[in-house]
């Protein structure tokens, strides 16, 4: 398993919530992305391809998420100080092979200014 700090802006704040950006290489066709808070799985999203190149998106731990061709964004709302923690994007690449797991992350700091406009 490869571990490292995200070398991009992982946290994007808006309206009392945060978008956590988990990037993956654009060559990746099938994968599972998990968002970890400390060691706890908060969210996951799995993209697989079936016969005829039909794309299937599944989520065992559902969060509001957004998929693009090189990233998964997970959205957390109603931020408070308890959200401050290390967050990790745990990427398991199934296709193309070989199977590979990468873990990248960063610390989410919560400041008063980010709590002002709560999204209800």
């Amino acid at each position: 398993e490869i571990n490292g700090s995200a070398n991009y802006e992982m946290f994007i704040f808006h309206n009392g919530g945060v978008q956590i950006l988990c990037k993956y290489p654009d060559i990746v066709q099938q994968f599972k992305m998990q968002l970890l808070k400390g060691g706890q799985i908060l969210c996951d999203l799995t993209k697989t391809k079936g016969s005829g190149n039909t794309v299937s998106i599944k989520s065992l731990k559902f969060c509001h998420s957004q998929l693009s061709n090189n990233s998964v964004s997970f959205f957390l709302y109603n931020l408070d100080h308890s959200h401050a923690n290390y967050y990790f994007c745990n990427l398991s690449i199934f296709d193309p092979p070989p199977f590979k797991v990468t873990l990248t992350g960063g610390y989410l700091h919560i400041y008063e200014s980010q709590l002002c406009c709560q999204l209800k």
Epitope: I2, P25, D26, I27, P96, P97, P98, F99, K100, T102
Partner: antibody
Framework: QVTLRESGPALVKPTQTLTLTCTFS??????????VSWIRQPPGKALEWLAL???????FYSTSLKTRLTISKDTSKNQVVLTMTNMDPVDTATYYC?????????????WGQGTTVTVSS | DIQMTQSPSSLSASVGDRVTITCRAS??????LAWYQQKPEKAPKSLIY???SLQSGVPSRFSGSGSGTDFTLTISSLQPEDFATYYC?????????FGGGTKVEIK
């Protein structure tokens, strides 16, 4: 045209560290999906995979040799370097580097000609 | 680690024979298997990737089949230049692993 060429010492002494360089052309290790791997073959024996480095600098090693191996890349020079510590006569082998291009599923599609390393005092 | 077991370890055959080499993985590897040919004092050459796809420039007498754990390399009509050692290799997961090789000798 894709080519790879291995270079390094022909003879090393036991306990020394071996440094091998793979110089390649025809592709770039900064291209998404590209990887370079090292493989060795002792005289009269089977191929043994050693290590691989990929485009985003992730590194993978043989389970039995990982404590002795380090792989690195210099993208600007089109080179991959493998170091192997604490060499022993059983490490006498021909060492190959090979390209693997993951998004095309080709396996180790192009190999260097190999460099022979003898470990002896 | 995934173990790759090849059989037989050697075989004798004549020009024109149909030759079959098998490779078994210790766990499922989908179709992520490659076959290589190696002649004495030469580097291996890639023959087949993704279990059944022929590398560019490889003669059509070579074919591969299988998925999961059991795979086969077939040479439909053995030619003099085909006498060599053949290796399978999985690239489903790290560490990558090779089979022990099959030496095809002249009968």
């Amino acid at each position: 045209q894709v080519t790879l060429r291995e270079s390094g010492p022909a003879l090393v002494k036991p306990t020394q560290t071996l440094t091998l360089t793979c110089t390649f052309s025809g592709f770039s290790l900064s291209t998404s999906g590209m990887c370079v791997s090292w493989i060795r073959q002792p005289p009269g024996k089977a191929l043994e995979w050693l290590a691989l480095i990929d485009w985003d600098d992730d590194k993978f090693y043989s389970t039995s040799l990982k404590t002795r191996l380090t792989i690195s890349k210099d993208t600007s020079k089109n080179q991959v370097v493998l170091t192997m510590t604490n060499m022993d006569p059983v490490d006498t082998a021909t060492y190959y580097c090979a390209r693997m291009s993951t998004p095309t599923y080709y396996g180790l599609d192009v190999w260097g000609q190999g460099t022979t390393v003898t470990v002896s005092s | 680690d995934i173990q790759m077991t090849q059989s037989p370890s050697s075989l004798s055959a004549s020009v024109g024979d149909r030759v079959t080499i098998t490779c078994r993985a210790s766990q499922g590897i989908s179709s992520w298997l490659a076959w290589y040919q190696q002649k004495p004092e030469k580097a291996p050459k890639s023959l087949i990737y993704a279990a059944s796809s022929l590398q560019s420039g490889v003669p059509s007498r070579f074919s591969g089949s299988g998925s999961g754990t059991d795979f086969t390399l077939t040479i439909s009509s053995l030619q003099p230049e085909d006498f060599a050692t053949y290796y399978c290799q999985q690239y489903n997961s790290y560490p990558l692993t090779f089979g022990g090789g099959t030496k095809v000798e002249i009968k």
